[in-house]
C-alpha cells in the first residue's frame, strides 16, 4: 500500500478495506483479519459482526463491508440489522414470557410472529359475520342482511395483517 | 491523531438523570461504531452500549430500561443519557472506538451519585 | 452474557521477572479478545487484539496467546514501566465484558 500524499489529511486517501496508521507515518495498511472499513479515510477498522448461536451468516464479512447475520430455522429477526432472533410460534399463537400461547377467543394471528389480535368487529361497518374467526384466521365479514337482495353479493375481505413496528436495538 | 473527550456534570443526584457527551476530533461518527463503558470504584468494567454510523443503537440489557446514546453528526458528539440513578451509578465514565487493530478511548469523567 | 475470570487480581513482580496473567471466557471466544493496560490516572492503551496480535508501537516484551476460553497476557521481562492494571475484554458477544483487572506492582 502507498503512502497517501494528500496535503490536507493524508489519511483522506486511503481507501475502504485500509486503515490509515499513525504508529507508520500515516499510510494506508490492509483491514487485519476479522475486521472491515467500510469507507475512507479510517484511522481503524471495524470489528467483523460475528454470527453466532441462533444467528447464522447470511453474508460473510470482507474487508470492506460487515457480516450480516440472519436466523436459524424455528426464529426469526427482530431489529435494525438483525440485532435479535425471536423465537417463532405456530399461527394461532404468540410469544410471550412464558413461551408461545394459544390466542384467546376473539383474537388472531395468521403468522408465526406477532401478535394475536382482534377479530374484526363486523357490526361496526354495518356487516354480518359471513364466516367465523378462529385463532388462525379473521373472520369474513358478509353484507348485512337488509342488503341481502337476490344477486347482491359483496363479501369484505379482512384487512391485510399488520405487523408490530420494532424499534433499532 | 483520533481524540474522544468526555464531558458532563461530575455530580448528579438519585434518581435525576446523567447526561454526558463525547466530543470526537479527528474521525467522524457517521463511521464506526461509538461506544460507553464505565469503571467502578474497585476497578470494575462495564460495556454500556453504542451508537453505529447508521444511528441505530445497541444497549447493554442490564441498562436497557434506562439508557439511551443519541448523536449529533453536526457537532461530531455523541450523547449519553442514564436516567433513575442510584449512587451503584458512580464510576468513571469513558467513551471509546473499538477497532481492529486500534481502539481509540476518551480520558474519562469521574461521575458522582449523591445527594 | 459472557464471564470473563481474570486471575490474578494483583500480584507483586520483580524487575527482569517474566510476568502471566490469565482470562478465562465462559464460553468459547473464538480469540475476540483485546489486552488493555491501564496507568493511574490514565485511560486504557490497547496492548494486544484478536488474542495474540500486537498493536504496533508496543514493545515486544508483551505478547498474548490463547484460543477457545482460555487466554494469557505475558510480559517476557518486566519494566518499571509497565506497572498498572491490566484487562482482558471479550468481544466476541454483546455486551462485550471485561475481565475483572490484574494490578501489577513492582516488588
Known amino acids: 500500500f502507498e503512502r497517501t500524499r494528500s496535503l490536507q489529511d493524508p489519511c483522506s486517501n486511503c481507501p475502504a478495506g485500509t486503515f490509515c496508521d499513525n504508529n507508520r507515518n500515516q499510510i494506508c495498511s490492509p483491514c487485519p483479519p476479522n475486521s472491515f472499513s467500510s469507507a475512507g479515510g479510517q484511522r481503524t477498522c471495524d470489528i467483523c459482526r460475528q454470527c453466532k448461536g441462533v444467528f447464522r451468516t447470511r453474508k460473510e464479512c470482507s474487508s470492506t463491508s460487515n457480516a450480516e447475520c440472519d436466523c436459524t430455522p424455528g426464529f426469526h429477526c427482530l431489529g435494525a440489522g438483525c440485532s435479535m432472533c425471536e423465537q417463532d410460534c405456530k399461527q394461532g399463537q404468540e410469544l410471550t414470557k412464558k413461551g408461545c400461547k394459544d390466542c384467546c377467543f376473539g383474537t388472531f394471528n395468521d403468522q408465526k410472529r406477532g401478535i394475536c389480535r382482534p377479530w374484526t368487529n363486523c357490526s361496526l361497518d354495518g356487516k354480518s359475520v359471513l364466516v367465523n374467526g378462529t385463532k388462525e384466521r379473521d373472520v369474513v365479514c358478509g353484507p348485512s342482511p337488509a342488503d341481502l337482495s337476490p344477486g347482491a353479493s359483496s363479501v369484505t375481505p379482512p384487512a391485510p395483517a399488520r405487523e408490530p413496528g420494532h424499534s433499532p436495538q | 491523531e483520533v481524540q474522544l473527550q468526555e464531558s458532563g456534570p461530575s455530580l448528579v443526584k438519585p434518581s435525576q438523570t446523567l447526561s454526558l457527551t463525547c466530543s470526537v476530533t479527528?474521525?467522524?461518527?457517521?463511521?464506526?461504531?461509538w461506544n460507553w463503558n464505565r469503571k467502578f470504584p474497585g476497578n470494575k468494567f462495564e460495556y454500556m452500549g453504542y451508537?453505529?454510523?447508521?444511528?441505530?443503537?445497541y444497549y447493554n440489557p442490564s441498562l436497557k430500561s434506562r439508557i439511551s446514546i443519541t448523536r449529533d453528526t453536526s457537532k461530531n458528539q455523541y450523547y449519553l443519557q442514564l436516567n433513575s440513578v442510584t449512587t451503584e451509578d458512580t464510576a468513571t465514565y469513558y467513551c471509546?472506538?473499538?477497532?481492529?487493530?486500534?481502539?481509540?478511548w476518551g480520558q474519562g469523567t469521574l461521575v458522582t451519585v449523591s445527594a | 452474557d459472557i464471564k470473563m475470570t481474570q486471575s490474578p487480581s494483583s500480584m507483586y513482580a520483580s524487575l527482569g521477572e517474566r510476568v502471566t496473567i490469565t482470562c478465562k471466557a465462559s464460553?468459547?471466544?473464538?480469540?475476540?479478545l483485546y489486552w488493555f493496560q491501564q496507568k493511574p490516572g490514565k485511560s486504557p492503551e490497547t496492548l494486544i487484539y484478536?488474542?495474540?496480535r500486537l498493536v504496533d508501537g508496543v514493545p515486544s516484551r508483551f505478547s498474548g496467546s490463547g484460543s477457545g476460553q482460555d487466554y494469557s497476557l505475558t510480559i517476557s521481562s518486566l519494566e518499571y514501566e509497565d506497572m498498572g492494571i491490566y484487562y482482558c475484554?471479550?468481544?466476541?458477544?454483546?455486551?462485550?465484558?471485561f475481565g475483572g483487572g490484574t494490578k501489577l506492582e513492582i516488588k
Open positions: 451508537i453505529s454510523y447508521s444511528d441505530s443503537a
Open positions: 471509546t472506538r473499538w477497532g481492529i487493530p486500534f481502539a481509540f
Open positions: 479527528g474521525d467522524s461518527i457517521t463511521s464506526g461504531y
Open positions: 484478536h488474542a495474540n
Open positions: 464460553q468459547d471466544i473464538d480469540s475476540y
Open positions: 475484554l471479550q468481544y466476541d458477544e454483546f455486551p462485550y465484558t
